[in-house]
């Protein structure tokens, strides 16, 4: 006999990286007929929703109007059908950004390289942080972590055309509080025609959309719950 219901999906809209003082909605999707959803923050109850009518609703939304460092952290949700509770969702890491300062991102030997060349990104921030994050914009929101007193280096090794794209970095004051994003650096990798066609550049957004940190395609990560859970869970681990 089943003792628990399947775990719900949890995600953040528009994104799990939220500029301070901006709003975010945490979504929890369970099953039709669920009479109660609970949102937990760092292991403690944060909010409760009892949707009406439960048989017509399978997703609830928990609104956070003003993101700050106290709201940043790990969230999970559960739901109940009758007296039976679900397994907890995967953890959602909600990150507050635009804290304190702006790092500088540079690339060596330069932003235009030939396929096979070794490339290293450098992220520098002169305030008290020792963890840095390098993000490549696009569908898959590639994230790398680096460490250093005021600067971290991110060696990409011999690059291919798949490394083409726009990069930014953040300084991290803790796992869930990040700096302003650096200015973008666009890496151009030239290679032979065959390689280029096999490794198209990730789709990216115009610079003015970065402010909302939508690092995904419109039909991509936000709606792909399994991938979203995976990305949110592994981003900082």
């Amino acid at each position: 006999q089943q003792q628990t219901l399947p775990k719900p999906f949890i995600w953040a809209e528009p994104h799990f990286m939220v500029p301070k003082e901006k709003q975010v909605t945490i979504c929890c999707q369970g099953n039709y007929g669920a009479v109660e959803y609970q949102l937990h923050f760092e292991g403690s109850l944060f909010a409760v929703d009892r949707p009406k009518p439960p048989e017509r609703i399978n997703k609830v939304q928990f609104y956070i109007p003003d993101m700050n460092s106290r709201m940043a952290g790990q969230y999970s949700c559960i739901y109940r059908v009758g007296e039976l509770w679900s397994e907890p969702s995967n953890l959602l890491d909600l990150v507050v950004t635009e804290m304190y300062d702006t790092p500088t991102l540079s690339v060596h030997p330069g932003p235009e390289v030939i396929s096979g060349e070794k490339v290293t990104f450098y992220c520098r921030l002169d305030t008290a942080t020792s963890m840095f994050l390098l993000l490549k914009e696009g569908r898959s929101s590639h994230v790398q972590r680096g460490y250093g007193k005021v600067q971290a280096e991110f060696p990409l090794g011999p690059v291919t055309t798949a490394h083409r794209g726009t990069y930014r970095c953040f300084g991290s004051y803790n796992n869930h509080a990040w700096s302003f994003p650096s200015e973008p650096v666009k890496l151009l990798v030239t290679g032979d025609i065959e390689n280029t066609s096999l490794a198209p550049e990730d789709p990216t957004f115009p610079a003015d959309t970065w402010g909302t940190y939508l690092l995904t395609t419109e039909t991509g990560l936000q709606k792909d719950h399994a991938l979203w859970d995976h990305t949110a869970q592994n981003l900082l681990r």
Epitope: Q23, T25, F41, S44, L45, F46, A47, V48, D49, R50, P51, K52, V60, Q61, F62, Y63, I64, P65, D66, R70, M71
Partner: nanobody, 130 residues
Framework: EVQLVESGGGLVQPGGSLRLSCAVS????????MGWFRQAPGKGLEFVAA????????YYADSVKGRFTISRDNSKNTAYLQMNSLRAEDTAVYYC???????????????????????WGQGTLVTVSS
């Protein structure tokens, strides 16, 4: 400027009743989830009860379930906490609180964490003693 003003506290004997009120001004009260918290002498802040903006969802701490009732009157911009069967351990300063932000809250959601609330009253003292 947002103002939350609690009233109704006082001295009451064990087993007695009190009704706390929380009048809200300066915000669109009718679309904001509300909550009551308390702080006993020498203790931390404790969640008591919460209510959704539509009144369709209420939620209580286990310690007050069945004895306390939270309600609201959106036409009067006021939230209430009816406290029955009071015990000595209910002695505390009671605070009402309103969430921040605009009008985007679900009609059925309540918040139980103090960190979710942006605006707080000054508190009203409830003393349960014989």
């Amino acid at each position: 400027e947002v103002q939350l003003v609690e009233s109704g506290g006082g001295l009451v004997q064990p087993g007695g009743s009190l009704r706390l009120s929380c009048a809200v001004s300066g915000r669109t009260f009718s679309r904001l989830p509300m909550g009551w918290f308390r702080q006993a002498p020498g203790k931390g802040l404790e969640f008591v009860a919460a209510i959704s903006w539509s009144s369709s969802t209420t939620y209580y701490a286990d310690s007050v379930k069945g004895r306390f009732t939270i309600s609201r009157d959106n036409s009067k911009n006021t939230a209430y906490l009816q406290m029955n069967s009071l015990r000595a351990e209910d002695t505390a300063v009671y605070y009402c609180a309103a969430v921040g932000g605009s009008l985007d809250y679900s009609a059925t959601v309540v918040y139980t964490a103090a960190r979710a609330y942006a605006d707080w009253g000054q508190g009203t003292l409830v003393t349960v003693s014989s």
